[in-house]
């Protein structure tokens, strides 16, 4: 696993321990909660991410209508199961024997069941749609500039490959980014999709995951692009099995940003 | 060279706690895990927890996480352990190691739990 | 939490001869094994990191394989004084586990 020779520090994921007594003597960076070694020249999944999150000392118009199926995050935070790779097990667990299965991205899409419940397959969550409100600004945002400062945040910062962000729309003040990356697509060493996303909500909502890194500046031309509202909707390979009962509400997780 | 030093022997009655140390030398202290590791007569090792001397963050095997407690003073390069609430199957010999593939080991402290 | 099975339990051979134990992960855990050493009244002593990275002071006879679930460790031609208790251990993950021992013992 590869870090910052030198000093030994993860540039990727401040949540980690870093010591040199990885293979071949190189520096070895454990994500907390795990203990897992992270590759620091990547993004750390979401699933390792979140169990870090959690052992740590105690968020004919252009725009795209998400569809029935979308999924949105209302469970909030938990400590989840990942497999050897770090990705989210299909079937997640509480304390209390409470279980539910979760698509690639780790938001729950059955019903809640009890320890007999099945989870067969880990669902990947092939389309992502983040639903932006940025503050007032003097005037909207040039709509070109807007889709290449987005799409290089993604390239540069998150190393996405470009072909993954499929659009950036925009209908001042809502900027939608839609992130499409099928099982089929993703090669060996692509930035997972979802893994890209957690990392901008996180360094939209000021909690940036990187090492020593400042903040994220969104800048279009020079101009500040504020976020004050995020909203993220997931889209899976195979549509979620809930109750009707849960079809007829409509549940969002907002994250307001100040 | 890269030395772990381990306190004495103990012996203790049920009930009361036990506090091992492990002073490190030959290597810089704060940049590799520390490890402890226990065994009971005639039985295998066991891992306990780790602890990372650099900012003290610690990692405790969940059959042990209401009773140990570890620490590091890194101005005496020295690890220690605090087993409180100590039963009769508590009764081993408690090792320190060094790094994730444990590459230097104390001598061994001997803990004896008896009424 | 890992399990690390080894086997056999006990291995009896003649001086002379290869050992070979097993070690085996209950799940994969690329190459994060380390094998130990550790004989009456001693602390344990490292032999081999990370399957089969060899250390510095250990006999050359001393070697490592596998990676996943699987791991060997393999003594060429063993001599008296490598007749001992060999234990397995995974760095992968917390908690770290080790196997429950493989005592090598003289036929």
């Known amino acids: 696993h590869t870090a910052a020779q030198d000093n030994c520090t993860c540039p990727t994921n401040k949540m980690t321990v870093c010591s040199p007594d990885g293979p071949g003597g190189r520096c070895q960076c454990r994500a907390l909660g795990s203990g897992m070694a992270v590759d620091c020249s990547t993004l750390t999944s979401k699933c390792l991410l979140l169990k870090a999150r959690m052992s740590a000392p105690k968020n004919a118009r252009t725009l795209v209508r998400p569809s029935e199926h979308a999924l949105v995050d209302n469970d909030g935070l938990y400590d989840p199961d990942c497999d050897p790779e770090g990705r989210f097990k299909a079937r997640q667990c509480n304390q209390t024997s409470v279980c539910w299965c979760v698509n690639s991205v780790g938001v729950r899409r059955t019903d809640k069941g009890d320890l007999s419940l099945r989870c067969d397959e880990l669902v990947r969550t092939h389309h992502i749609l983040i639903d932006l409100r940025h503050r007032p600004t003097a005037g909207a945002f040039n709509h070109s500039d807007l889709d290449a400062e987005l799409r290089r945040l993604f390239r540069e910062r998150y190393r996405l490959h470009p072909k993954f962000v499929a659009a950036v729309h925009y209908e001042q003040p809502t900027i939608q980014i839609e992130l499409r990356q099928n099982t089929s697509q993703k090669a060996a060493g692509d930035v997972d999709i979802g893994d890209a996303a957690y990392y901008f909500e996180r360094d939209i909502k000021g909690e940036s995951l990187f090492q020593g890194r400042g903040g994220l500046d969104l800048r279009v031309r020079g101009e500040p692009l504020q976020v004050e509202r995020t909203l993220i909707y997931y889209l899976d390979e195979i549509p979620p099995k809930f109750s009707m009962k849960r079809l007829t509400h409509h549940h969002h997780h907002h994250h307001h940003h100040h | 060279q890269v030395q772990l030093v381990q306190s004495g022997a103990e012996v203790k009655k049920p009930g009361a706690s036990v506090k091992v140390s492990c002073k490190a030398s030959g290597y810089s202290f704060t940049t590799h895990w520390i490890h402890w590791v226990r065994q009971a007569p005639g039985q295998g090792l066991e891992w306990i927890g780790t602890?990372?001397?650099?900012?003290?963050?610690?990692v405790y095997n969940q059959k042990f996480r209401d009773r140990v407690t570890m620490t590091a003073d890194r101005s005496i390069s020295t690890a220690y352990i605090e087993l409180s609430r100590l039963r009769s199957d508590d009764t081993a010999v408690y090792y320190c190691?060094?790094?994730?593939?444990?590459?230097?080991w104390g001598q061994g402290t001997t803990v004896t739990v008896s009424s | 939490e890992i399990v690390l099975t080894q086997s056999p339990a006990t291995l009896s051979l003649s001086p002379g001869e290869r050992a070979t134990l097993s070690c085996r992960a209950s799940?994969?855990?690329?190459?994060?094994i380390h094998w130990f050493q550790q004989k009456p009244g001693q602390s344990p002593r490292l032999l081999i990191k990370?399957?089969?990275e060899s250390i510095s002071g250990i006999p050359s006879r001393f070697s490592g394989s596998g990676s996943g679930t699987d791991f060997t460790l393999t003594i060429s031609s063993l001599e008296p004084e490598d007749f001992a208790v060999y234990y397995c251990?995974?760095?992968?993950?917390?908690?770290?586990?080790f196997g429950q021992g493989t005592k090598l013992e003289i036929k």
């Open positions: 251990q995974h760095s992968h993950s917390w908690p770290f586990t």
């Open positions: 990370y399957a089969s």
């Open positions: 799940q994969n855990i690329g190459t994060s």
């Open positions: 602890i990372f001397p650099s900012n003290a963050y610690a």
């Open positions: 190691a060094r790094a994730s593939y444990f590459d230097y």
